[in-house]
């Protein structure tokens, strides 16, 4: 017996040869002898199956002795054995009718699970084999489950069914609902200009939801809400501004903030948060600001960081073309007595400067 | 054709009220964030007011705002702005606009309406 | 509100001649920008949005570049119909605002 796998959804064609190159009487019928289709002369007859109105043949083949049996729109249920009668002979397939599934939607935020659900006949045995947009094999019976989806796992997973040796594929695609970063870090010398952006990984035609930026500066005790805003159509419209720091907010996506100056009081990190409607969980992305000032007191050139600085950054003082008078792995550094000249304070990480700032010492006289 | 055209606009002694209508044509009006954007004679353009196009939030620049109300009528077609309390400050030509599929500027304009605030 | 800065008011040219005009915002805009054209007892008419791209119908003797808060509008050969008024218009967020205007006149 020949078998056939089928897709939920899709049209197949089963066939059916005759041994003469011309139309002559045939019948397809089920496991139960439900005629579905034949022909009188020239004509489609169809009989009283389930099938009536998703089963068609080509009429054009009848003149070479082919007779297929097309069934569109598969369901599982139309799994069976189909007999093809034709020259006082039998032709029987066997047809398997599979279909998977995402558990709720294609759409999940980044870190939570996808589930794939295989529907298949009963009787049947399948095994599952998935691969996701970044080449990862997973396998499984009815059911494969895959926890924390990461923004990779964005895109066509392809899945092979496989039974009686024979396979089918299914494409499925995911939509792993993040930022493009999870986190981000902005230097700026004090007084500068501040923009954070929140680009999307995603694209969708509507986009609606909430956010909030909570802030925690590093002077600060405890966190306090920078803004507000809600997300509608992919405009974004602010609902609550804190007015220290009096933020500016872009009215399109990619969400887009500016601070109008960096000030030590500001510097620390962020966390912008945003819910989207009709799904459970929050996007997250995490951003920080660190905030250099070189100053000259006196007899005292003291240059100095705020925020949140990994212990491997080197902070140093040095005078303009020449060696570095100060370098340390600190928050802070200073010169006494500075000479005149231009001086560079700079925050670098392995020797890739990251931040610098320039300040003038005056002769004295 | 995408078309506005706006009406309304006349002389009005100061204190008095005003209101302007755009009627919009040949595209999904309700779609579309819309403007109002005036010019005083021998001046340049200056935005008045804004209303989106999903949210219908309303927006004014602090020269107008308190005074000066947006609305849209759907059924309609009609962008209006209601002017209250007018001054001679207020005396323009005011410009209805729509603004571009995911704003993309303001790529439509009316041929204008005049007001004129003096007693 | 975001102040826009236009510059310069006014400038004399001659036909053929490459003319920029500047445009700086007080805060950082991205590329939320657009240059409109103006002739008298006409209404604006829109240039350049996303403070790069060429609105549809606009001869391509037009360009505008920028983001942040420095933005740029070049006509590169200039033509008889350019001697207008053009302005740029932030549409960060609202209130939007406008630029000065700048009169370009034939000399």
């Known amino acids: 017996k020949k078998v056939v796998l089928g897709k939920k959804g899709d049209t197949v064609e089963l066939t059916c040869t005759a041994s003469q190159k011309k139309s002559i009487q045939f019948h397809w019928k089920n496991s139960n002898q439900i005629k579905i289709l034949g022909n009188q002369g020239s004509f489609l007859t169809k009989g009283p199956s389930k099938l009536n109105d998703r089963a068609d043949s080509r009429r054009s083949l009848w003149d070479q002795g082919n007779f297929p049996l097309i069934i569109k729109n598969l369901k599982i249920e139309d799994s069976d054995t189909y007999i093809c009668e034709v020259e006082d002979q039998k032709e029987e397939v066997q047809l398997l009718v599979f279909g998977l599934t995402a558990n709720s939607d294609t759409h999940l935020l980044q870190g939570q699970s996808l589930t794939l659900t295989l529907e298949s006949p009963p009787g049947s045995s399948p095994s599952v084999q998935c691969r996701s947009p970044r080449g990862k094999n997973i396998q499984g019976g009815k059911t494969l489950s895959v926890s924390q989806l990461e923004l990779q796992d964005s895109g066509t997973w392809t899945c092979t069914v496989l039974q009686n040796q024979k396979k089918v594929e299914f494409k499925i695609d995911i939509v792993v609902l993040a930022f493009q970063k999870a986190s981000s870090i902005v230097y700026k010398k004090e007084g500068e200009q501040v923009e954070f952006s929140f680009p999307l990984a995603f694209t969708v035609e509507k986009l609606t939801g909430s956010g909030e930026l909570w802030w925690q500066a590093e002077r600060a005790s405890s966190s306090k809400s920078w803004i507000t805003f809600d997300l509608k159509n992919k405009e974004v419209s602010v609902k609550r501004v804190t007015q220290d720091p009096k933020l500016q907010m872009g009215k399109k996506l990619p969400l887009h903030l500016t601070l109008p100056q960096a000030l030590p009081q500001y510097a620390g990190s962020g966390n912008l948060t945003l819910a989207l409607e009709a799904k459970t969980g929050k996007l997250h992305q995490e951003v920080n600001l660190v905030v250099m000032r070189a100053t000259q007191l006196q007899k005292n050139l003291t240059c100095e960081v705020w925020g949140p600085t990994s212990p491997k950054l080197m902070l140093s003082l040095k005078l303009e073309n020449k060696e570095a008078k100060v370098s340390k792995r600190e928050k802070a550094v200073w010169v006494l007595n500075p000479e005149a000249g231009m001086w560079q304070c700079l925050l670098s990480d392995s020797g890739q400067v990251l931040l610098e700032s320039n300040i003038k010492v005056l002769p004295t006289w | 054709e995408v078309q506005l055209l706006e009406s309304g606009g006349g002389l009005v002694q100061p204190g008095g009220s005003l209101r302007l209508s755009c009627a919009a044509s040949?595209?999904?009006?309700?779609?579309?964030?819309m403007s109002w954007v005036r010019q005083a004679p021998g001046k340049g353009l200056e935005w008045v007011s804004g209303?989106?196009?999903?949210?219908?939030?309303?927006y004014y620049a602090d020269s107008v705002k308190g005074r000066f109300t947006i609305s849209r009528d759907k059924s309609k077609n009609t962008l209006y702005l209601q002017m209250n309390s007018l001054r001679a400050e207020d005396t323009a030509v005011y410009y209805c606009?729509?603004?571009?599929?995911?704003?993309?500027?303001?790529?439509?304009w009316g041929k204008g309406t005049t007001v004129t605030v003096s007693s | 509100a975001i102040q826009m800065t236009q510059s310069p008011s006014s400038l004399s040219a001659f036909v053929g001649d490459r003319v920029t005009i500047t445009c700086r915002a007080s805060?950082?805009?991205?590329?939320?920008l657009g240059w409109y054209q103006q002739k008298p007892g006409k209404a604006p008419k829109l240039l350049i949005y996303?403070?790069?791209s060429l609105q549809s119908g606009v001869p391509s003797r037009f360009s505008g570049s920028g983001s942040g808060t420095d933005f740029t509008l070049t006509i590169s050969s200039l033509q008889p119909e350019d001697f207008a008024t053009y302005y740029c218009?932030?549409?960060?967020?609202?209130?939007?605002?406008f630029g000065q205007g700048t009169k370009l006149e034939i000399k």
């Open positions: 805060q950082g805009i991205r590329n939320d």
């Open positions: 218009l932030q549409d960060y967020n609202y209130p939007y605002t």
């Open positions: 996303a403070a790069s």
């Open positions: 209303i989106s196009g999903s949210v219908g939030s309303t």
């Open positions: 040949g595209f999904t009006f309700s779609s579309y964030a």
């Open positions: 606009a729509k603004e571009g599929y995911d704003w993309s500027g303001m790529d439509v």
